[in-house]
Interface confidence: low
């Protein structure tokens, strides 16, 4: 979604004449009509597919047009669009003379046109104005234009919607390309994740707002890195919550019994904590990374199976690393991503895994589109059928049902009804606006001369000398039955008096 802006700057019509050459009386009260449409190699009349706008009368003959945007005026002219800017356009600017106050097209005489310019080309979205000047024999127009995105729309084609927000669902502003830019203290795809107090323990602490460090159960301290020992622990500490590991020389469940085996023998290795547990018995509580009765064995950090959801653990010098299976991510593979298992494809679309299942792509059936096959394709929106033809969606394609007298894929061809020789028996065919008409020869009738009409050949009394006339129905001709003493096809010759021939 965006706006095509046209800034009219100066119009020169020194002689104050119309396009026809006729002068305006008393001067050319000039207003403009603007038509913005899709790119045409040769700009032709037709629908202004991207929009139209008209100005009031801006001046007489030659004048400068002042920038009126600050006062809520109409210069620059605004032509909003609510689709992805295609990057190309055609523009028609007409200057008209307004004899009166009614500027509607039907109220103006046809020769009120002063000048008409048509340009076309490429235009990228941007803040910079393109200056242009068009000159004809009698007029000159100076103007500039640009395309900018509507509020909350971004990107090269004004197709990315981004609305800054600062609430439960995100804390961000929008970059010029439409990507999110998190507000200070927030992170994550939608900037919903607060950045906790620096040093706040990754596992044991969390926060609901920036620069906070709230401890999970069992942990305490400013950075949540101190465990809470078991309730009642007297002379002990903890390495994980609710533990009670006794100090040297103390024993018992709550380290409240004084024993000295650990103090005297120091049996625990590698910095382990020794707990006396009765006469000559002790327990070593090993530091992370060690095991064995006396904590003498080095332990792989992967032995505790820290990787979730089937992730595989790899030991490293400074700890371990989880290799996550498709569809999971995070330090311990604890987060899942959307995949084909989530049935993301609508309207019967089939899902295909990508990047070993890390993401997916939908293959849409005919008539549906969009990254999740959520949009229905309507191939009739552009009204492709000419001459009043009706557009029908037919599965993956479209077809035009033509009105009588028209044919062709888009009903663009006028059918000559006489082309298929519809008139029978030598009838003459005449094309009419709503069909055809047959002029029939003698002896035939009907819409297509298909009906044979019986002609009474004897009606004209063709037989002479009181001969009897008979009609031959098979040939629609007559036969004369002559009385005694006469011969000839019409009984016109007396017997014995031969006809006089010219030789």
């Amino acid at each position: 979604s965006g706006v095509f802006q046209l800034q009219l700057q100066e119009f020169i019509n020194e002689r104050g004449v119309l396009a026809s050459g006729r002068p305006c009386e008393p001067g050319c009260r000039t207003f403009f009509r603007v038509c913005l449409k899709h790119f045409q190699a040769v700009v032709s009349p037709g629908p202004c597919t991207f929009g139209t706008v008209s100005t009031p009368v801006l001046g007489t003959n030659s004048f400068a047009v002042r920038d009126d945007s600050s006062g809520g005026g109409r210069n620059p002219l605004q032509l909003p669009f609510n689709f992805t800017w295609p990057g190309t356009f055609s523009l028609i600017i007409e200057a008209w003379h307004a004899p009166g106050d009614d500027l509607r097209p039907e109220a103006l005489p046809p020769d009120a046109l002063i000048s008409k310019i048509a340009i076309q080309g490429s235009l990228a979205v941007g803040q910079n104005w393109l200056l242009d000047e068009q000159t004809s024999t009698l007029t000159r127009l100076r103007y500039s234009y640009r395309v900018i995105c509507s509020d909350n729309y971004y990107g090269d084609n004004c197709s990315r919607l981004c609305k800054k927000r600062n609430d439960h669902f995100g804390h961000y502003v929008c970059q010029p390309d439409g990507n999110l830019s998190c507000l200070p203290g927030w992170t994550g795809e939608y900037c919903q994740q607060p950045i906790c107090l620096s040093g706040c323990h990754e596992q044991n602490g969390y926060c609901s707002k920036p620069a906070e460090c709230l401890c999970r159960p069992g942990w305490q301290g400013r950075l949540c890195n101190e465990c809470i020992p078991h309730n009642g622990c007297r002379h002990g500490t903890c390495s994980t919550p609710w533990q009670c590991t006794c100090d040297e020389g103390w024993g018992g469940l709550f380290c409240d019994q004084d024993l000295n085996y650990c103090t005297h023998h120091s049996p625990c290795k590698n910095g382990a904590t020794c707990s006396n547990s009765g006469q000559r018995s002790y327990t070593c509580t090993c530091r992370p990374g060690y095991t064995g009765v006396d904590c003498e064995l080095e332990l792989s950090e992967c032995d505790s199976n820290p990787c979730r959801n089937g992730g595989s653990c790899k030991d490293q010098e400074d700890g371990y690393h989880c290799l996550c299976p498709p569809g999971y991510y995070g330090l311990h593979c604890e987060h899942s991503t959307l995949s084909c298992a989530d049935s993301p494809c609508f309207n019967g679309g089939s899902c295909r895994e990508r990047n070993q299942g890390a993401n997916y792509a939908c293959e849409c059936p005919p008539n549906f589109t969009g990254s999740n096959c959520e949009k229905k394709v309507d191939r009739c929106t552009s009204n492709p059928c000419a001459n009043g033809g009706q557009c029908l969606n037919r599965g993956p394609s479209r077809m035009c049902r033509c009105r009588p007298g028209f044919t062709g894929t888009y009903c663009e061809l006028h059918v000559s009804d006489c082309a298929r020789n519809p008139c029978a028996h030598g009838g003459t065919c005449h094309d009419l606006e709503n069909g055809l008409m047959c002029t029939c020869p003698a002896g035939f009738s009907g819409r297509r001369c298909e009906v044979r009409t019986s002609i009474d050949a004897c009606a004209s009394s063709p037989c002479f000398n009181r001969a009897t006339c008979y009609t031959d129905l098979s040939t629609d001709t007559f036969v004369c039955n002559c009385p005694y003493g006469f011969v000839g096809s019409r009984c016109e010759f007396p017997v014995g008096l031969p006809p006089s021939f010219p030789w």
């Epitope: 669902f169 939608y190 993301p344 609508f346 999740n372 959520e374």
Partner: nanobody
């Protein structure tokens, strides 16, 4: 504070119907998708249906397609799940959830759930 409250669960015989409701508060309801997932004892959660912010896009898991219908009433800040031809395997706790965005992608907030039991 974001709140999603489910209701309408209960005990029903196989072949019967139930209509679950999810009443939302604490956010701009018609800006966000709302969905339903369920969790049966000892099983992984299963996303069963979702409806986009506009209501123009819905999806259903294969296991409920043709039997369940999701709808929303933006004026009442409520989403409904009409469940017909119920089967014993539909027994679970049903949760209402929102991803916090307009499209059905992920889960950010969930309700406390409502129990649905289908007896044979």
């Amino acid at each position: 504070e974001v709140q999603l409250v489910e209701s309408g669960g209960g005990l029903v015989q196989a072949g019967g119907s139930l209509r679950l409701s999810c009443a939302a508060s604490g956010f701009t309801f018609d800006d966000y998708a709302i969905g339903w997932f369920r969790q049966a004892p000892g099983k992984e959660p299963e996303g069963i249906s979702c409806i986009s912010s506009s209501g123009g896009i819905t999806y259903y898991a294969d296991s409920v397609k043709g039997r369940f219908t999701i709808s929303r009433d933006n004026a009442k800040n409520t989403v409904y799940l009409q469940m017909n031809s119920l089967k014993p395997e539909d027994t679970a706790v049903y949760y209402c959830a929102t991803p916090g965005i307009a499209a059905c992608r992920g889960i950010h907030y969930t309700g406390q759930g409502t129990q649905v039991t289908v007896s044979s």
